[in-house]
């Protein structure tokens, strides 16, 4: 159950999808990826205030316990709820091949 | 691909399963849950240093970009990789029922 999408901290401050441009060198991929030379990495960044985009029951519990014991229990964290596939042309044991990665680019975010 | 399980920060400092004892009042459940009166909540807590229990390619990217742009990209976060089911005896519109929740107690943790 995804809870509220209204961010009480102000526009853009809560958990949402961001795009970060990164080179192969930035990613440490220069020695095994041929293409693309640059990746638009979509990732989940932002705060997870009470019940904001709570992914499930566990996230709701975490929010309650964080309120009670903030030094022991961290607030929920903004992570991918789903991914978009990405194709890389990469070096492999048997030459160069096209590989699809299903867990590389975040598509949607939630708090957990 | 789950990466290294060795914590460079010292024993117990990295992402792992913790148990937090919580009453129904703590969880805000006192008005709709009859049993159990207390829950041993298992949750994922701890740091996610470079490549520690990296859940997938996205987590590896996040580590690389956090190292480069720590103010923009947060470090990976310790979250459940899987859950244990939990049965609650709860009040419903038509009386009392037994409900199984599949997303309440963390079973295993990883960094993402």
């Amino acid at each position: 159950a995804r809870n509220g999408d209204h961010c009480p901290l102000g526009p853009g401050r809560c958990c949402r999808l961001h795009t970060v441009r990164a080179s192969l060198e930035d990613l440490g991929w220069a020695d095994w990826v041929l293409s693309p030379r640059e990746v638009q990495v979509t990732m989940c960044i932002g705060a997870c205030p009470s019940q904001f985009r709570a992914a499930n029951m566990h996230a709701q519990i975490k929010t309650s316990l964080h309120r009670l014991k903030p030094d022991t229990v961290p607030a929920p964290c903004c992570v991918p709820a789903s991914y978009n596939p990405m194709v890389l042309i990469q070096k492999t044991d048997t030459g160069v091949s096209l590989q699809t990665y299903d867990d590389l680019l975040a598509k949607d975010c939630h708090c957990i | 691909a789950r990466n290294g399980d060795h914590c460079p920060l010292g024993p117990g400092r990295c992402c792992r399963l913790h148990t937090v004892r919580a009453s129904l009042e703590d969880l805000g459940w006192a008005d709709w849950v009859l049993s159990p009166r207390e829950v041993q909540v298992t949750m994922c807590i701890g740091a996610c240093p470079s490549q520690f229990r990296a859940a997938n390619m996205h987590a590896q990217i996040k580590t690389s970009l956090h190292r480069l742009k720590p103010d923009t990209v947060p470090a990976p976060c310790c979250v459940p990789a899987s859950y244990n089911p939990m049965v609650l005896i709860q009040k419903t519109d038509t009386g009392v029922s037994l409900q199984t929740y599949d997303d309440l107690l963390a079973k295993d943790c990883h960094c993402i």
Partner: antibody, heavy 112, light 107 residues
């Protein structure tokens, strides 16, 4: 099974051009690279160049960059190598290959 | 370019003998090295890839080893059908480069 079927022997006159073909089967043509290799009589193997059918990118041995042009036709899963301004020095057997698989070779004879 | 120096350029060996051929790269090739066997008038046949992985269907008497710049192909017990020319290829960086070849003949 993977097969690379090359076109038949060619006899051409000096100064002419020729286009050799390599038809791939048994795998997804656009997902793997193809190399072209030359073997002159009683000599070793020389790497001419590389093409990735997925995006058409190419790499050439500096020695052959003004001699060879690599292309592909993805609709027929065929790789081509065009050789221009032929001289007797270009008489050789030409192979298309992946790291694990080799075509049977095409014999090119340049003679007036 | 990464130059591949293969040795010996030719050799004679007896049936049942252990044979080793080496390839040295001028720079580290991260184990991106393959070995081929070629018989007269035939196309090369890949034996080993990524320095030490045996191609399916290739007899287990063939093995590859090495890392960094130095690699070797070993035939544990030479058989008659093993005579031919052996080539190495580095496919770590473009341009890919071949060794000069080793002609193996039976004594």
């Amino acid at each position: 099974q993977v097969q690379l079927q090359q076109s038949g022997a060619e006899l051409v006159k000096p100064g002419a051009s020729v286009k050799l073909s390599c038809k791939a089967s048994g795998y997804t043509f656009t997902n793997y690279d193809i190399n072209w290799v030359r073997q002159r009589p009683e000599q070793g193997l020389e790497w001419i160049g590389w093409i990735f059918p997925g995006d058409g990118s190419t790499k050439y041995n500096e020695k052959f960059k003004d001699k060879a042009t690599l292309t592909t036709d993805t609709s027929s899963s065929t790789a081509y190598m065009q050789l221009i301004r032929l001289t007797s020095e270009d008489s050789a057997v030409y192979f298309c290959a992946r790291i694990l698989y080799w075509g049977q070779g095409t014999t090119l004879t340049v003679s007036s | 370019d990464n130059k591949m120096t293969q040795s010996p350029s030719s050799m004679y060996a007896s049936l049942g003998e252990r044979v080793t051929i080496t390839c040295k790269a001028s720079q580290d090739i991260n184990s991106y090295l393959s070995w081929f066997q070629q018989k007269p008038g035939k196309s090369p046949k890949t034996l080993i890839y990524r320095a030490n992985k045996l191609v399916d269907g290739v007899p287990s008497r063939f093995s590859g080893s090495g890392s960094g710049q130095d690699y070797s192909l070993t035939i544990s017990s030479l058989e008659y059908e093993d005579m031919g020319i052996y080539h190495c290829l580095q496919y770590d960086e473009f341009p890919y480069t071949f060794g000069g070849g080793t002609k193996l003949e039976i004594k």
